[in-house]
Interface confidence: low
Amino acid sequence: KEVCYERLGCFSDDSPWSGITERPLHILPWSPKDVNTRFLLYTNENPNNFQEVAADSSSISGSNFKTNRKTRFIIHGFIDKGEENWLANVCKNLFKVESVNCICVDWKGGSRTGYTQASQNIRIVGAEVAYFVEFLQSAFGYSPSNVHVIGHSLGAHAAGEAGRRTNGTIGRITGLDPAEPCFQGTPELVRLDPSDAKFVDVIHTDGAPIVPNLGFGMSQVVGHLDFFPNGGVEMPGCKKNILSQIVDIDGIWEGTRDFAACNHLRSYKYYTDSIVNPDGFAGFPCASYNVFTANKCFPCPSGGCPQMGHYADRYPGKTNDVGQKFYLDTGDASNFARWRYKVSVTLSGKKVTGHILVSLFGNKGNSKQYEIFKGTLKPDSTHSNEFDSDVDVGDLQMVKFIWYNNVINPTLPRVGASKIIVETNVGKQFNFCSPETVREEVLLTLTPC
């Protein structure tokens, strides 16, 4: 079957849209009138109250839309709505760093139904966004290169459809945990893929299988750059007990949403924080998350590391290939940004059994104490570890070393760090030295060698 609409063209239920393994039911999308796609414009001039706009010259001209600015569309997912706080929060953070037309796309008319139907309705949403982009081009000479479409869950595939319909001319699409059911393993035509825009970046946060784990997001790579924070399956801070999950810092409603789909929603929270932390989400190219956590992917290669989220487009190698995979760790609550350091400690003093911790002090801030090693502390041995600091300390000025005994030792042994090397993710090294030793639980300050 096929249905046709004046503005948006025809939609069929032929393969691959329906009748394939991943979507066996022959279902057509609802009509544009029923999906009721709305465009809610926020700008630097109206950051708190949207202006509803349409693909119409008088509507655009009568709004705060500026043709000399980039335009970022934000598309929500299943059951969600365009007036939800998270979309406006993305816009508000954008206004802190740029002048931009920020358009929240509401399609709750089509998202609040069964999942299978909603997964078809995104075709209408994508067509509506494509129509809007093409209208801006024809009416105002506005280049699709200046358009960035950000889509969460089903919205990521709606963004892909918008990109496909504009022949890949859209500047950028960001997929925030693109939805898995009805999309994973399907042909590129149906889902978000790298040919949908000049640059496609993706954040995976809920990649466990939908059955039996209820992972709503794709594990499949679908962009030029695919980021897997915390491995892309289980996000820190999402395993709280029910009460603390629901009574959330952002309120009961956000807490209830988190309880239902915490990992899945983390993707847009990471993106929101990334806007105001331009270097706080460095993604490391690596074979797998296991290899990353084994400290085998540090520092960044000579070409640098891309930043997950808003600043991914600054990465020089962003379109060198498709399906480039990157790994990183984040915090367990906002601010989610983290800065990774490698610390190598060369010990001096007595041989004891215990553990050593180091804290960093720099021109931008100071870190907490992080454990570098636990076990036998032998003089002249060197121990290394990587950790993710919630503070960007900047250029290192000094480090502090402390050690703890694992067993009571009446001889009060002294241990020191003759040298500590701190390496930042860009490979910059800082060397600190001290000839001294200290008793356990006493801080030793090391200064540049």
């Epitope: 022949n167 890949g168 500047g171 790298p194 040919s195 000049k198 640059f199 379109t319 060198n320 498709v322």
Partner: nanobody
Framework: QVQLQESGGGLVQAGGSLRLSCAAS????????MGWYRQTPGKERDVVAT???????NYADSVKGRFTISRDNTLNTVYLQMNDLKPEDTAVYYC???????????????WGQGTLVTVSS
């Protein structure tokens, strides 16, 4: 198959101006960065100016304030306006673009044949 065709080179007096054009043709999906490079005999090809699809530009120090790069995305064309030309600007000027052919996912680096700019004193 994607081609780049430069035009606008020639002989000009020191202090004069020239405008180079480079048009991309063929099966183009999209173009990311476009730019101009130049090469003198026995030397490496050096970047002169680049412009990204969003409009951000980058210039070699030696041409800042004298050369202006611009681009027409609808025509898949990049321009280099060269003012206050100096004899040391004499070189073969090459157009460069990162092009994603239609219905593919990877960008390819494409070069033009080059156009000679001669600045006489």
């Amino acid at each position: 198959q994607v081609q780049l065709q430069e035009s606008g080179g020639g002989l000009v007096q020191a202090g004069g101006s020239l405008r180079l054009s480079c048009a991309a043709s063929g099966s183009i999906g999209s173009i990311h960065t476009m730019g101009w490079y130049r090469q003198t005999p026995g030397k490496e090809r050096d970047v002169v100016a680049t412009i990204q699809d969003g409009g951000s530009t980058n210039y070699a120090d030696s041409v800042k304030g004298r050369f202006t790069i611009s681009r027409d995305n609808t025509l898949n064309t990049v321009y280099l306006q060269m003012n206050d030309l100096k004899p040391e600007d004499t070189a073969v000027y090459y157009c460069n673009a990162d092009v994603r052919p239609y219905r593919t996912s990877r960008y390819l680096e494409v070069w033009g044949q080059g156009t000679l700019v001669t600045v006489s004193s």
